[in-house]
Amino acid sequence: SGVFQLQLQEFINERGVLASGRPCEPGCRTFFRVCLKHFQAVVSPGPCTFGTVSTPVLGTNSFAVRDDSSGGGRNPLQLPFNFTWPGTFSLIIEAWHAPGDDLRPEALPPDALISKIAIQGSLAVGQNWLLDEQTSTLTRLRYSYRVICSDNYYGDNCSRLCKKRNDHFGHYVCQPDGNLSCLPGWTGEYCQQPICLSGCHEQNGYCSKPAECLCRPGWQGRLCNECIPHNGCRHGTCSTPWQCTCDEGWGGLFCDQDLNYCTHHSPCKNGATCSNSGQRSYTCTCRPGYTGVDCELELSECDSNPCRNGGSCKDQEDGYHCLCPPGYYGLHCEHSTLSCADSPCFNGGSCRERNQGANYACECPPNFTGSNCEKKVDRCTSNPCANGGQCLNRGPSRMCRCRPGFTGTYCELHVSDCARNPCAHGGTCHDLENGLMCTCPAGFSGRRCEVRTSIDACASSPCFNRATCYTDLSTDTFVCNCPYGFVGSRCEFPVGLPPSFPW
């Protein structure tokens, strides 16, 4: 299916005469009849096998024909056909004079014919127009023509039907030759098959739309390459769908039998050691002082009379404790205590008897401490130095070495770096932990505001009307050099228009 299109461009009949040579009155009101038919070596009258079309009156005598495809499709003229284009044709174009308004063949006198042209040849389907001009003794006709396929028809003969679609039956557009061109993400003869997510497992995965990867029963994951264990599986995995391969410590068909009760349930109490002894069975080895299947019962450790030398036993949460009689000490009161006769005091400490000689006390000299004066006093242990000062032991005393900026016995005083007014030109001083900082007034910079910097008074563009601005470095002010026609400190007033003051 296609359309033969004929575009009439210009008709010349300068003398305004009919084919018979008789002039038209008042002029030749010209319309055209077109006949399209199969190829004939010699074009002869007969049926217009491919179609006919007539125009209204297009002009008088000589005229150019407007392209009127938008206004009703009269030019180019359309000769549709619904068969395979054969590639050859015959074309007859007749120009007629219309004395009245009735253009029907039977309403016209036979001598109303102005001119008749007949051509034949081969014509391929395509978008390009073929331009032609036919001249007779008295007339000239310029025109162009082409054959194009109807919507949804393609190929050299407009015989290939292709209608683009994007639905369940296909996802494609049509190429110029009528072949299907699949939309992105679709494949197959009719572009009905989605292209799944790249890497989607060929057997285990499928898709219903492009870039998707849906898994067949028993498979999971982004690419459907990992299996799903059996529905009843409890502590297992799989290498193929619905398997149940037990994790370590589990057994049974569905991996629900506990072979490692110790790890999974920690049944033994009070620090006992657990040993697996079969499915869901275990043995607890208790720590001293505990008994029971799970070592949950505490033995009274005083039952074995562990305290010696008359010591009394007291049960405690984590064992027992011996209260020793005077003169004995140790876990089980197994050691007898020292007396001053044993010279127990070190570093010149003096011994004093207590409780009728049952025990003693040491009086320690300075710099020593402990029940036997065995420890040297470290006066720095209490960290007495503030603000990061370093503590130094100096014989019987101590001293603090302070960080810069601090003073005092314990470095507790902050030395003010601002006390000596270090900031020049009226700069404001700020004490910091590690020194000081100066905030400089306008026109000065540097760590101590010692550098003079000029203020660019022109930076704010204070001058109007394209005046030139100059900075007075001595006073840090600006001067405006006014262009002709302007006055004022900022060149803001036009000459001849004095400022209007409100009084």
């Epitope: 898994c215 029963p217 999971q220 994951g221 982004r222 264990p229 599986c233 409890r234 995995t237």
Partner: antibody, heavy 118, light 107 residues
Framework: EVQLVESGGGLVQPGGSLRLSCAAS????????MAWVRQAPGKGLEWVAT????????YYRDSVKGRFTISRDNAKNSLYLQMNSLRAEDTAVYYC???????????WGQGTLVTVSS | DIQMTQSPSSLSASVGDRVTITCRAS??????LAWYQQKPGKAPKLLIY???NLADGVPSRFSGSGSGTDFTLTISSLQPEDFATYYC?????????FGQGTKLEIK
């Protein structure tokens, strides 16, 4: 014994958010895909979302896509459903279930009620 | 999406009766069908998977059959604890879909 216990349901206004949790025990949680299935009052069952055990791939029913997010924390044996932009039609009992979209739902929690109403 | 249609939507029966519930899929789902039992206020419970496999701990009076698009759940001799709502579910195609349910009541 396999146990799935949901929590986090409640009354929320349309457009609001809610986060459901599901605590799993009695099986090796990290080995199994999990899902959320809901049941509107007096209605049938409706699959909502699924997450794989292997790589955390997620799937959602069309009506919740872009609003709900399923996630899991294998270290905590927990499954979650973050629900945003809630609508009245999301009102349902939400069940945590063990299974994928292409396998039966072998074990179910007791459910948690989500009511979306102004 | 595949539509699952259960029939009947409700039925009354007596203890000891043989009961059959059917489930029809809108397209072929092979044998990828499960049946669930749900009692009021409780969670569903898996009864049968892969059309005819009994889930762990489910009594043998429950059985399943069918393939393709037509499936059946049969309870050979009703017990008092069997009165509940039964759902079928297909897991052959994404997304998974359930039937609307069949309520089994005491006559």
């Amino acid at each position: 014994e396999v146990q799935l216990v949901e929590s986090g349901g409640g009354l929320v206004q349309p457009g609001g958010s809610l986060r459901l949790s599901c605590a799993a025990s009695g099986f090796t949680f990290s080995n199994f895909p999990m899902a959320w299935v809901r049941q509107a009052p007096g209605k049938g069952l409706e699959w909502v979302a699924t997450i794989s055990s292997s790589d955390g791939t997620t799937y959602y029913r069309d009506s919740v896509k872009g609003r709900f997010t399923i996630s899991r924390d294998n270290a905590k044996n927990s499954l979650y459903l973050q629900m945003n932009s809630l609508r009245a039609e999301d009102t349902a009992v939400y069940y945590c279930a063990r299974g994928y979209y292409n396998s039966p739902f072998a074990y179910w929690g007791q459910g948690t009620l989500v009511t979306v109403s102004s | 999406d595949i539509q699952m249609t259960q029939s009947p939507s409700s039925l009354s029966a007596s203890v000891g009766d043989r009961v059959t519930i059917t489930c029809r899929a809108s397209e072929d789902i092979y044998s990828n069908l499960a049946w669930y039992q749900q009692k009021p206020g409780k969670a569903p419970k898996l009864l049968i998977y892969d059309t005819n496999n009994l889930a762990d701990g489910v009594p043998s009076r429950f059985s399943g059959s069918g393939s393709g698009t037509d499936f059946t759940l049969t309870i050979s001799s009703l017990q008092p604890e069997d009165f509940a709502t039964y759902y079928c579910q297909q897991y052959n195609n994404y997304p998974p879909t359930f039937g609307q349910g069949t309520k089994l009541e005491i006559k």
